[in-house]
């Protein structure tokens, strides 16, 4: 196999008895993406697969970047919070049991939720065989794979390969269509010697040799262009050091009252379980760990406040206190922990060292192609397509990996709008109620009438504003029974949610500023009722009073208007959103400084922003009754997050509104919190922390959609599968490995 050139088969070349291509899912634990480029010459077989087949620059692991959570994510398409295997070690207060890799408890089906690939295949009439895979020797939903091997790490790799080849030799009626294969290397060697070590190099040669044996065995059976093979890893690997340790004893006078899952992705819970599990004061722990040292190498979070892109909160097994640790550092209880040096993983899945490999080859896959990175939650849908079966519900976005396939099996389409919109019409230029708002600049009713008349756009003006400010179409509302209307202005368009009494979204385009002349002075101390929205559906300005710790923010920033007069279009109740005063500082800095920077760098950006309500922190928009539970004696619900989606043209010679090809996206989902303690901003100007904070909360457009019930880019003329690629793209700015 190795000596031959890449075969370019237009259709599957399967021998007699193989009606449809088998699928082999092959995992090499801890094979970080960088190894593939640094040591390619030492891995001729894997390198040939990379050259001849399709590969991604890397595949993103889910957080925490550990073995069991990611292997099970790969075969279910679910986030760890959804499938339940949230770490290699965990406690479930409802089961009152501990899960670990060294105990038989791991084979208790109660830990394993979701539907793994082997069951999806079996439920649809196919056989499945697993040569090791986390979960494969557990009776999930009462069933095991058709063929499985009890885990035994001492079985030589060659023996594993020859067994799998024997399975492929089984009579057609007994032969599986789906296979898994698992190697512990290069992870074991990476832990022992670190990622840059002779041990890893040796391990890479060993796994490459075994992989070559598989490919040679397939060739002997004339299956090398029949089998669809996916070679991937669960996560990467990074170096750790014994002088890069954070000890909890440096932060607490005593530590015996809590239990800590130590390492690169630490969690803290009560020591006395189950008794103290729910009464444990997690908030106090986070307070005591926040902004304690100038060079602190972890950030403490309550899990609902973690970046939403992590999807690591909604599970009782995920302890409320979470430490987000710096690259190559470890957080542990005390100096008695000497488990350092060598390699480790579990860190932030955006770190380049945590990136995993993804390569694929076979009749269904494109050849000699490199694709952009994607997340491992997408692999399950891809495997279902390869097997031509229906996936179980999962967190992947079906169709987003269609560009890997020669002929896609599943053709996605845009979601149908669930709640239709109306237009909030202009009836009277004078408000029937002031809504307790005031504007000292408008001294009489004639002036008020004048500025309100500006809200009454002609059809031509509406068409013009839509073209510029909604270049990819308005966001469609996928939530049920959401009464909302469109509000058109010359410089922005918004979708107003009547039940929430606030805009659901606001869309506007910031041009590349040709001149650097300052924006006109803003008229911030002025607010008035929007005459197009009935008072019963509007916010009252008196909602924003001091003892609520909440101030008014503008979703569309009034200062973005180029003239003082047009600012009045934004100084209206329909543009108001509730914001914590400290949050608003960050929000205002983003819009007045960072947004202009982005627009300048990208030849203009389209901005869509809005509130998010995710009180139950499940990553999905809350039902109205869930939000109502959190109304603190007020008519206006306080968002848990705000989103901002920046879209520009990939080809920077085009503006967003005239973009013929691919788009570039930069979405943010910023937790709406009363303080900025996450950034330790004391004594620091905004320039030193706001951008970093926004960057920490970058997300995918898809994450925004799930949290808002909105659907974006429906009017962008581009195949839906390409739009899905855009929506599942996560921008990253990590440069060092």
């Amino acid at each position: 196999w190795l000596e031959e050139n890449c075969d370019t088969a237009q259709q599957s070349q399967c021998p007699e008895g193989f009606d449809l291509p088998p699928v082999i899912l092959f995992s090499m634990d801890g094979f970080r993406a960088e190894y593939l480029y640094t040591w390619d010459t030492l891995m001729p077989n894997i390198n040939k697969l990379k050259t001849c087949g399709i590969h991604s620059k890397y595949m993103r692991a889910m957080y925490p970047t550990k073995t069991f959570p990611n292997h099970y994510t790969i075969v279910t398409g679910l986030y760890p919070e959804s499938h339940g295997i949230i770490d290699n070690n965990m406690y479930d207060v409802n089961l009152n049991k501990n899960f670990s890799l060294s105990s038989k408890e791991q084979n208790n089906p109660a830990w394993w939720h979701g539907q793994p690939m082997w069951l999806t295949a079996m439920y649809q009439g196919l056989k499945a065989a697993t040569y090791f895979w986390p979960g494969s020797e557990v009776a999930i939903n009462g069933s095991f794979p058709s063929i499985y091997m009890p885990y035994n790490g001492s079985v030589p790799f060659e023996e594993r390969i020859s067994t799998l080849l024997k399975w492929l030799d089984l009579p057609k009626a007994e032969r599986p269509r789906f296979y898994t294969m698992y190697f512990e290397e290069p992870d074991s060697s990476g832990h022992a010697g670190g990622p840059v070590s002779a041990r890893v190099i040796k391990a890479l040669q060993v796994v490459d040799h075994a992989f070559g044996m598989l490919m040679e065995g397939l060739k002997q059976r004339n299956l090398h262009n029949c089998v669809n093979i996916i070679l991937l890893a669960d996560h990467g690997m990074d170096q750790t050091y014994c002088n890069k340790m954070e000890y909890m004893t440096d932060y607490f006078p005593r530590i015996n009252f809590f239990y800590m899952y130590e390492g690169p992705a630490p969690r803290i819970r009560a020591h006395n379980i189950p008794h103290d599990f729910f009464s444990f004061n997690s908030e106090e722990i986070v307070r005591n760990l926040s902004c304690r040292k100038p060079d602190q190498h972890f950030k403490p979070y309550l899990t609902p406040d973690l970046p939403k892109r992590l999807h690591y909160a909604k599970n009782v097994r995920i302890d409320k206190v979470h430490l987000f640790v710096d690259q190559q550092w470890l957080a542990v209880r005390s100096k008695s922990n000497t488990n350092c040096g060598g390699g480790n993983h579990g860190y932030n899945n955006e770190f380049r060292s945590m990136e995993a490999i993804f390569l694929a080859h076979g009749p269904s896959f494109k050849e000699k192609t490199e694709v952009e990175p994607f997340e491992n939650i997408e692999v399950y849908n891809l495997m279902c397509d390869l097997l031509r079966i229906q996936p179980a519900p999962n967190n992947g976005t079906h169709g987003s990996l269609n560009h890997l396939l020669k002929v896609p099996f599943y053709e996605p389409s845009h979601a149908e709008e669930v709640s239709k919109f109306s237009v909030c019409g202009f009836a009277n230029p004078l408000p029937t109620e002031s809504l307790d708002c005031f504007c000292p600049h408008l001294q009489n009713s004639t002036q008020l009438e004048q500025v309100n008349q500006m809200l009454n756009l002609t059809q031509e003006e509406i068409t013009a504003t839509v073209k510029v400010n909604l270049p990819f179409g308005r966001p469609r509302v996928l939530q049920k029974n959401v009464d909302h209307c469109l509000l058109y202005h010359r410089e922005y368009v918004s979708g107003f949610g009547k039940a929430m009494r606030m805009p659901m979204w606001s869309s506007y385009t910031v041009p590349q500023l040709g001149d650097t002349s300052p924006l006109p002075p803003t008229v911030p101390d002025c607010l008035r009722a929007d005459v197009r929205v009935p008072p019963s559906e509007s916010q009252k300005c008196s909602f924003y009073l001091a003892d609520k710790n909440i101030t008014h923010g503008f979703l569309y920033p009034p200062a973005s208007n180029r003239t003082s007069d047009s600012q009045y279009d934004a100084l209206i109740t329909s543009n108001l959103v509730p914001m914590y005063e400290e949050f608003r500082k960050m929000w205002d800095y983003f819009h007045s400084v960072l947004l202009i920077k982005h627009a300048t760098e990208r030849n203009g950006v389209n901005v869509v922003s809005g509130p998010i309500f995710d009180y139950n922190y499940d990553g999905h928009f809350d039902a109205p009754d869930e939000i109502t539970k959190h109304l603190a004696n007020t008519d206006v619900p306080i968002p848990t997050h705000y989103f901002v989606v920046l879209t520009s043209c990939k080809n920077k010679s085009h503006t967003p509104e005239n973009c013929p090809g691919w788009l570039d996206v930069l979405p943010f989902i910023i937790p709406h919190r009363p303080t900025n303690v996450e950034s330790c901003p004391e004594g620091k100007p905004e320039a030193l922390w706001v951008e970093e904070r926004f960057t920490a909360h970058i997300a995918r457009v898809r994450d925004v959609e799930l949290l808002t019930g909105l659907d974006f880019y429906q009017d962008k003329v581009q195949p839906v599968s390409e739009i899905l690629q855009l929506k599942t793209y996560l921008p990253t700015f990590e440069t060092t490995i």
């Epitope: 008229v523 911030p524 607010l527 008196s542 924003y544 001091a546 101030t551 008014h552 005063e581």
Partner: antibody
Framework: EVQLVESGPGLVKPSETLSLTCTVS??????????WGWIRQPPGKGLEWIGS???????YHNPSLKSRVIISVDTSKNQFSLKLSSVTAADTAVYYC?????????????WGQGTLVTVSS | QSVLTQPPSASGTPGQRATISCSGS????????VNWYQQVPGTAPKLLIY???QRPSGVPDRFSGSKSGTSASLAISGLQSEDEADYYC???????????FGGGTKLTVL
Amino acid sequence: EVQLVESGPGLVKPSETLSLTCTVSGGSISSSSYYWGWIRQPPGKGLEWIGSMYYSGSTYHNPSLKSRVIISVDTSKNQFSLKLSSVTAADTAVYYCARHYITVAGIFDYWGQGTLVTVSS
Amino acid sequence: QSVLTQPPSASGTPGQRATISCSGSSTNIGSTIVNWYQQVPGTAPKLLIYSNNQRPSGVPDRFSGSKSGTSASLAISGLQSEDEADYYCAAWDASLNGPVFGGGTKLTVL
């Protein structure tokens, strides 16, 4: 807890300019959420609003006093000031500085303790 | 002459209920919210009721406010001796383009 403290001379001669300063602590005068205002109360009488200002410098005043009033801000010192020119005996009052929420008319939630200014020769 | 009209005095015995009225016009009370302030002699006024009927934190629920048309009223139930003070109503006046106050009502607890 926000605190406001008025300071300035307690005695001003007729036709001169009354100058008072209000120092804010426990909160920033540069907050985008508040106006900072002056109110006065002649002895044994009711309250009268003089004028208010926003940290950016925009101000508005009681029309009956407007031509005589200047309100200014010094964000670096977290202070704002009142100047009332051409004073007469009718301007004798306790002068209060206060904070009110930007979006809502005239809800003064925090007040200084007040300073008595007597206009007399 | 104050823009908003209040009775100069009101009284009640401990435990009783007292009511203070405030009358304005369409340019003030009729088109916006009413706020009430309490001023104990020798001290600064304190916000007692805002937005017609909302109490800032720390104000007992014995104090309540209401508004109807161009008039408003403050009610104090279960009068206590410490309630003895001057009470001022206030509202934004659109024609003045600023806040206006009532002349104040001196409440005596007998």
